[in-house]
């Protein structure tokens, strides 16, 4: 069977070769070929070429669509690490340091304080804040951590809030707050973390972090 297939392939190849040679002869205007024959052969060849080109275009389109499909849903994720700051602001500062993540330019850390997204969609946003406080040294008010959203054309909005009472441990007791939820973000929206007393936040490795993930 294989031998017969081989003979068949060789015969087809020979026919193709003869066909190509005939086109060549037509082009050089050899007297032995009639004009009618040449016209027929030429139009046949043009048909083949057209088919080949159309196939090529289709493949190109499919490939570019695949690329677009991939581009439409790239992974968007960020995880940033807390940074001690001399600023008295209640907004926590973050840095791209240690074991951080910044998937691509569709999410950016702006002014060290907010994560800004370029694409609309549902995002899981989270923050862990570890703080060390003492009941006697602190005010009566609990330690509050807030996850806030600022979108273009809108006032900032609190998405999530958590409160912990101060520890009685001396000099201070470590406690952690974890906030996390799924929210619809618009292009240009920024999320940031606010705390009642930034001086009590622990910046040791792994204690305080902030991030998001596009679902």
């Amino acid at each position: 069977h294989r031998r017969l297939d081989k003979i068949e392939d060789e015969r087809n190849l020979h026919e193709d070769f003869v066909f190509m040679k005939t086109i060549q002869r037509c082009n050089t205007g050899e007297r032995s070929l009639s004009l009618l024959n040449c016209e027929e052969i030429k139009s046949q060849f043009e048909g083949f070429v057209k088919d080949i080109m159309l196939n090529k275009e289709e493949t190109k389109k499919e490939n570019s669509f695949e690329m677009q499909k991939g581009d439409q849903n790239p992974q968007i994720a960020a995880h940033v690490i807390s940074e001690a700051s001399s600023k008295t602001t209640s907004v926590l500062q973050w840095a791209e340091k240690g074991y951080y993540t910044m998937s691509n330019n569709l999410v950016t850390l702006e002014n060290g304080k907010q994560l800004t997204v370029k694409r609309q969609g549902l995002y899981y946003i989270y923050a862990q804040v570890t703080f060390c406080s003492n009941r006697e040294a602190s005010s009566q008010a609990p330690f509050i951590a807030s996850l806030c959203l600022k979108s273009p054309g809108r006032f900032e909005r609190i998405l999530l809030r958590a409160a912990n009472t101060h520890s009685s441990a001396k000099p201070c007791g470590q406690q952690s707050i974890h906030l996390g939820g799924v929210f619809e973000l618009q292009p240009g929206a920024s999320v940031f973390v606010n705390v009642t007393d930034p001086s009590q936040v622990s910046h040791g490795t792994g204690f305080t972090s902030f991030g998001l993930l596009k679902l």
């Epitope: 054309g153 909005r157 609190i158």
Partner: antibody, heavy 119, light 107 residues
């Protein structure tokens, strides 16, 4: 039905103080950003102050340091404490609710309270 | 600060006519523009936000258009209750600023 009712306006001397109130009903007050907007005698509208649902406050340069916006979520009241008043603060003061909780556009306005600063 | 320039300052028209009021921002505000109507002795009322979205209860004869820095409010087939003053306001960022107003009077 959303209702906003301003009060506390009146005649005050330059350098004096006044506290405006806006009593609200018909919506969940603490979920919305609220603002004060004034209309001058020449009918120009000027933004005066805003407070977000998270209690962040915003002011234009013309009133920053002189005016303070605050809210009492338990009583559904918005306040504007005005001090060091000037003649250019003379206007009709409106309180307004922000559309869709936190948009900068304002969908409901009160009937206004008049403030005149004059010696 | 973003300056909002409104024109014309005043306009006379008859019932049934179509009028257009324009508003220009000193820098791009994308589609963050609102239009308000104020009748004599009353408080302003939101007509349009996000440049073209009609507020609840606003008749369809009102329409907003534009983006970037150029915006317009069109009122088709004017009704007696449409006469009054109209203000644009950018709602892109703070400070919030309003246009100077357009007084629409009955011809």
């Amino acid at each position: 039905e959303v209702k906003l009712v301003e009060s506390g306006g009146g005649l005050v001397k330059p350098g004096g103080s006044l506290k405006l109130s806006c009593t609200t009903s018909g919506f969940t007050f603490n979920n919305y950003a609220m603002s004060w907007v004034r209309q001058t005698p020449e009918k120009r509208l000027e933004w005066v102050a805003s407070i977000s649902s998270g209690d962040s406050t915003y002011y234009p340069d013309s009133v920053r340091g002189r005016f303070t916006i605050s809210r009492d979520n338990a009583r559904n009241i918005l306040y504007l404490q005005m001090s060091s008043l000037r003649s250019e603060d003379t206007a009709m003061y409106y309180c307004a609710r922000h559309y869709d909780y936190d948009s900068y556009a304002m969908d409901y306005w009160g009937q206004g309270t008049s403030v005149t600063v004059s010696s | 600060d973003i300056q909002m320039t409104q024109s014309p300052a005043s306009l006379s028209a008859s019932v049934g006519e179509t009028v257009t009021i324009t508003c220009r921002a000193s820098e791009t505000i994308y589609s963050y523009l609102a239009w308000y109507q104020q009748k004599q002795g009353r408080s302003p009322q939101l007509l349009v936000y996000n440049a073209k979205t009609l507020a609840e209860g606003v008749p369809s004869r009102f329409s907003g258009s534009g983006s970037g820095t150029q915006f317009s409010l069109k009122i088709n087939s004017l009704q007696p209750e449409d006469f009054g003053s109209y203000y644009c306001q950018h709602h892109y960022n703070t400070p919030l600023t309003f246009g100077t107003g357009t007084k629409l009077e009955l011809k």
